[in-house]
């Protein structure tokens, strides 16, 4: 019996087609992805093959103005329109709190939403009961397939799930659910979830009875043969893991941003064992036409977005200096504003010993593309912020050793004075440079804000200590020459859309007046 698994993950509000780098589409003839194009390809496959499941491995939420405005209603509507069969909860599904998950998505989705390792307690337990499930048995033709969900147990540090959801260890939580499916005579089981490729592989290895793992979170691109675009494969598709009980378990993921549609064909024997598995992600490029009906619907929903862009988010009573003359040479108040917003967006009081889990922010000055003039009645709009942060990036959470941070700050000024983008703006950091010294030895003082303290204060950076830092995904991926971050990071979790982070902060503060205050000397 043959099953076709179509899968997406980490779509992050890319409902419309995008450029090849998943930013805003500028030249339509070269654009990719989007739900209208995805639907065309999905329908093509549904028409050609008998047993097809369309699955999503989480993080539909967060990433563009679509999410900012529609808050998840767009996800439910278009996933329903595409007739998804199941979705696993990702960490970003909790970005607007549990209510922001329940109302727009859980109550509106026609498909099951899954996670076996999230357990509700207290008053939430009855409110959320039945709205998400640990597993679902799906009939496919004359057979049945069990889908069991999982979500990153780091979610409380990455999003806003509140205090009434417990995120258990994935493997510990999955095993009894898979065992239950086996007692129900379900012998074909897919683990669908959002914990990253390393955990996906562990699940394939450790959870007895799981036949296939469909993952997300780490934006992993797997491919067999010559890859069709810019993404470099982390391995073959599917990635085969030998389980502890000797089975060959295919593990797949489909990069991110709706650029690819994962396509995996699995052949099962009559006892539900995987005989063979093959496939590849399908690049959703302009050779695949956008479905006119879905496209028309997208255009209808788009209208509200254009109106939103020009509405006032808040006010500034000072000039927000985002000029390259400032931000690439010295501390600039736009950099301070953005870093303050980044830390504010990551306030998670999950431990009494810590005032917060993260206190530090770094931001490449070259990523700040425009100032905002306060003389326009002080008004700040989404449109203004889109000029400051035009690249559609995210502000991510990484874990770095102090020694890596020291290298990063040396790189920040290794060729100071040439108006290059690697000059770092900061938050929760006090850095002193001596530019008379030779490159690689210019950082004379580097103090960082404590986290394990009730009164935050600055302490010298310790080379061997591991620190959490918020930074743009561009830096996490080694951009602007920060190869040491990419090579030496110990953990990387993608965060919220950059503009959304700053706009939320401005809306919360209502009136802002960021100063230059001696963070960089």
């Amino acid at each position: 019996w043959e099953l076709t698994i179509l899968h997406t993950n980490d779509v992050h509000s890319r409902l419309e087609q995008t450029s090849e780098d998943s930013s805003k589409c500028v030249n339509a003839s070269r654009c990719m992805g989007g739900v209208a194009r995805l639907f065309t390809k999905v329908q093509q496959i549904r028409r050609a093959e008998p047993n097809v499941l369309l699955l999503d491995a989480g993080d539909q939420y967060q990433g563009t103005i679509w999410f900012t405005v529609y808050k998840g209603a767009e996800v439910a509507h278009f996933m329903n329109a595409l007739r998804y069969d199941a979705m696993a909860l990702g960490n970003h599904e909790f970005d607007n709190g549990v209510e922001g998950l329940i109302e727009p998505l859980l109550k509106e989705a026609k498909f099951p939403i899954l996670s076996a390792n999230i357990k509700a307690k207290g008053p939430l337990a009855s409110q959320i009961s039945g709205l998400y499930l640990p597993y679902k048995v799906l009939p496919v033709g004359d057979e049945v397939v069990g889908i069991v969900g999982y979500t990153s147990k780091e979610t409380p540090f990455l999003s806003n799930p509140g205090t009434n959801l417990v995120f258990e260890d994935e493997i510990t939580a999955l095993q009894p659910e898979v065992d239950k499916l086996k007692t129900l005579n379900v012998n074909k089981i897919i683990a669908l979830g959002h914990s990253g490729f390393e955990m996906d592989k562990l699940i394939a290895q450790k959870v007895r009875g799981v036949d296939v793992v469909v993952g997300g979170h780490s934006n992993t691109f797997l491919y067999t043969g010559n890859p069709p675009s810019k993404e470099v494969p982390a391995g073959k598709y599917p990635f085969i893991v030998t389980s502890d009980d000797g089975r060959k378990v295919p593990v797949v993921q489909a990069y991110a941003f709706g650029k690819y549609l994962g396509y995996l064909k699995i052949e099962f024997d009559e006892r539900g064992n995987v005989i063979s598995s093959h496939g590849n992600p399908i690049l959703l490029n302009s050779s695949i036409p956008e479905d006119p009906s879905i496209k028309a619907d997208i255009n209808k929903w788009r209208i509200k977005l254009d109106n939103y862009s020009t509405q006032e988010l808040g006010k500034t009573i000072v000039y927000l200096d985002g000029s390259s003359q400032s931000c690439r040479f010295r501390e600039c108040n736009m950099g301070n504003l953005i870093c303050d917003a980044m830390i504010n967006n990551n306030l998670r009081h999950t431990d009494e010993m810590f005032w917060n889990h993260v206190s530090m922010c770094i931001l490449n000055g070259g990523g700040i593309r425009s100032p905002i003039d306060e003389r326009n009645n002080g008004t700040i709009t989404w449109e203004n912020l889109a000029a400051v942060l035009p690249f559609g990036g995210t502000f991510d959470l990484v874990q770095l050793k102090g020694s890596t941070l020291k290298k990063a700050f040396e790189h920040s000024v290794h060729r100071y004075g040439q108006s290059t983008g690697e000059f770092l703006q900061v938050g929760g950091i006090h850095v002193v440079y001596d530019l008379s010294r030779k490159p690689g030895d210019r950082v004379v003082k580097l103090d960082v804000l404590c986290t394990k303290c009730r009164v935050p204060s600055y302490d010298p950076l310790k080379m061997d200590e591991v620190y959490k830092v918020i930074l743009p995904n561009f830096l996490a991926n080694g951009g602007d020459g920060f190869q040491m971050i990419k090579d030496e990071l110990l953990r990387h979790d993608s965060g919220d859309q950059d503009i959304n982070v700053v706009s939320t902060y401005i809306s919360k503060m209502k009136v802002i007046y960021p100063a230059v205050e001696g963070r960089i000397k």
Epitope: Q43, A81, R83, L138, P139, D142, E143, V144, D291, S293
Partner: antibody
């Protein structure tokens, strides 16, 4: 082979009740949504009810809502339509039809031969 | 409710003719449209689903097209066994609704 066979039709007085059955064979009945569709003499097709594969949801058009109840017994591979408060306009051939394997609306790939229901005094 | 309007309601054609039947939905239904053939005193038979997919066992002279609100069923070369009534049906949302039918008669 895949087959649907309806039974239980007949002549009934207005206001009375009737129960139709549809026996299935040749496929995994419990995996499919099942529908009733009717056709009044000389008229077109009208959808009457659906029950999802797991009985989790049932849907009806306004014309029969509150009067007709669809049910299924997966252990017997049988679909039912309980028709109460019958009216003259319910006179039709009633077909049972197989839908899809999910909770989304679907088309019908397999049809029974139909059973005639006549509501007349 | 979504109304389905079929045209023409009847047509006369000869064996070998190309026949086109149209179906219009009162609102967008994407490609969630099916076509059925019904002969007198018989149950309907599924021809096409998802607007353009041929049900297995259906001759390739039948084809469907369209998306959104406008759909077409085409019989490329009418055969004697094709004289029947044809219905479209939307399955975008409940309640499921059918077109009024198109009777294809021998000229």
């Amino acid at each position: 082979q895949v087959q649907l066979v309806e039974s239980g039709g007949g002549v009934v007085q207005p206001g009375r009740s009737l129960r139709l059955s549809c026996a299935s064979s040749g496929f995994t009945f419990s995996n499919y949504g099942m529908h009733w569709v009717r056709q009044a003499p000389g008229k077109g097709l009208e959808w009457v009810a659906v029950i999802l594969y797991d009985s989790s949801n049932k849907y009806y058009p306004d014309s029969v809502k509150g009067r007709f109840t669809i049910s299924r017994d997966n252990s017997k591979n049988t679909l039912y339509l309980q028709m109460n408060s019958l009216r003259a306009e319910d006179t039709a051939v009633y077909y049972c039809a197989r839908g899809g394997s999910s909770w989304y609306p679907d088309s019908f790939d397999i049809w029974g031969q139909g059973t005639m229901v006549t509501v007349s005094s | 409710d979504i109304q389905m309007t079929q045209s023409p309601s009847s047509l006369s054609a000869s064996v070998g003719d190309r026949v086109t039947i149209t179906c219009r939905a009162s609102q967008g239904i994407s490609s969630w449209l099916a076509w059925y053939q019904q002969k007198p005193e018989k149950a309907p038979k599924s021809l096409i689903y998802a607007a353009s997919s041929l049900q297995s066992g259906v001759p390739s002279r039948f084809s469907g097209s369209g998306s959104g609100t406008d759909f077409t069923l085409t019989i490329s070369s009418l055969q004697p066994e094709d004289f029947a009534t044809y219905y479209c049906q939307q399955y975008n949302s409940y309640p499921l609704t059918f077109g009024g039918g198109t009777k294809v008669e021998i000229k």
